[in-house]
């Protein structure tokens, strides 16, 4: 297993609709054809997997149908979008990239993006 540098923004504020997008960029040492991207969430010392996708270079990322993540790839960049977020989902979202094929296997883990999520203010009661 060889190490690889992964860069991602330090801080992102999700939209009022609970959507957060960020780029995960990796310094590929070679010409990988198969890449696996995993998003991990760290909060209160607990790490959980949010979503993961394996893709062939030049093709779209394919997450599971019920995944809250979508993404696109361009060269050594992966543009990740996480939707359906609420204030309780605020936390550090870590991008993990694995170059699966061809060998050698490379692994890179970013420092994480602190995603802040604000629940929308409830609408004031109206007589109309």
């Amino acid at each position: 297993c060889k190490a690889m540098h992964v860069a991602q923004p330090a801080v992102v504020l999700a939209s009022s609709r609970g959507i957060a997008s960020f780029v995960c960029e990796y310094a590929s040492p070679g010409k990988a054809t198969e890449v696996r991207v995993t998003v991990l969430r760290q909060a209160d010392s607990q790490v959980t997997e949010v979503c993961a996708a394996t893709y062939m270079m030049g093709n779209e990322l394919t997450f599971l149908d019920d995944s809250i993540c979508t993404g696109t790839s361009s060269g050594n960049q992966v543009n990740l979008t996480i939707q359906g977020l609420r204030a309780m989902d605020t936390g550090l979202y870590i991008c993990k990239v694995e170059l699966m094929y061809p060998p050698p296997y490379y692994l890179g883990i970013g420092n994480g993006t602190q995603i802040y999520v604000i629940d929308p203010e409830p609408c004031p009661d109206s007589d109309f």
């Epitope: 923004p9 801080v11 992102v12 504020l13 999700a14 605020t90 936390g91």
Partner: antibody, heavy 116, light 108 residues
Framework: QVQLVQSGAEEKKPGAAVKVSCKAS????????ISWVRQAPGQGLEWMGW????????HYAQKFQGRVTMTTDTSTSTAYMELRSLRSDDTAVYYC?????????WGQGTLVTVSS | EIVLTQSPGTLSLSPGERAILSCRAS???????LAWYQQKPGQAPRLLIY???SRATGIPDRFSGSGSGTDFTLTISRLEPEDFAVYYC?????????FGPGTKVDIK
């Protein structure tokens, strides 16, 4: 090294608006947020809101909602805070700070005086 | 919104003494994302401690932070003349970010 440099002191009349700038250098501007904090004479720190320089999304303190606008110009790595309908109790030093996410770097502060 | 309460309001001590400052949150601070800042008259605040217990770059080791959940402490092991200032705690675990009212450490 990381630096946040703010615009100079302003004197305004009640009802007017003020726009304070905060120019960042020494880091990738869009990777962080910029928060605005004010301090009235002899008082504590009051958080006003912040902007994510990555996407321009904002979150304002409820007290300032509708009266404040925070923006960024990523081409010049500059953040702006505009406060409208100024009152005498808006007289304060206004600080910008990098959201890293702790507020790890601060501007030198901009004194805004509101007086008729 | 998380409300932070600091105590005492003022702490009168002599150089060389230990200072213990308290910060209490109205609800648990997410990931212990609590910071301490020092502010001297006419200056911008300076980050001392983040993540409840990590010292910021260039901060002397006489400053230490501890605590978790809702109760946090800043300790200055031996006060130096330059440590007399106002200290603020702040939570950045959730937005809105909030500050405590501050503790003034002055010379006895």
């Amino acid at each position: 090294q990381v630096q946040l440099v703010q615009s100079g002191a302003e004197e305004k009349k009640p009802g007017a608006a003020v726009k304070v700038s905060c120019k960042a250098s020494g880091y990738t501007f869009t990777s962080y947020g910029i928060s605005w904090v004010r301090q009235a004479p002899g008082q504590g720190l009051e958080w006003m809101g912040w902007i994510s320089a990555y996407n321009g999304n904002t979150h304002y303190a409820q007290k300032f909602q509708g009266r404040v606008t925070m923006t960024t110009d990523t081409s010049t790595s500059t953040a702006y805070m505009e406060l409208r309908s100024l009152r005498s109790d808006d007289t304060a030093v206004y600080y910008c700070a990098r959201v890293g996410p702790p507020f790890d770097y601060w501007g030198q502060g901009t004194l805004v005086t509101v007086s008729s | 919104e998380i409300v932070l309460t600091q105590s005492p309001g003022t702490l009168s001590l002599s150089p060389g003494e230990r200072a213990i400052l308290s910060c209490r949150a109205s609800q648990s601070v997410s990931s212990n994302y609590l910071a301490w800042y020092q502010q001297k008259p006419g200056q911008a605040p300076r980050l001392l401690i983040y993540g409840a217990s990590s010292r910021a770059t260039g901060i002397p080791d006489r400053f230490s932070g501890s605590g978790s959940g809702t109760d946090f402490t800043l300790t200055i092991s031996r006060l130096e003349p330059e440590d007399f200032a106002v200290y603020y705690c702040q939570q950045y675990g959730n937005s809105p970010f909030t500050f405590g009212p501050g503790t003034k450490v002055d010379i006895k």
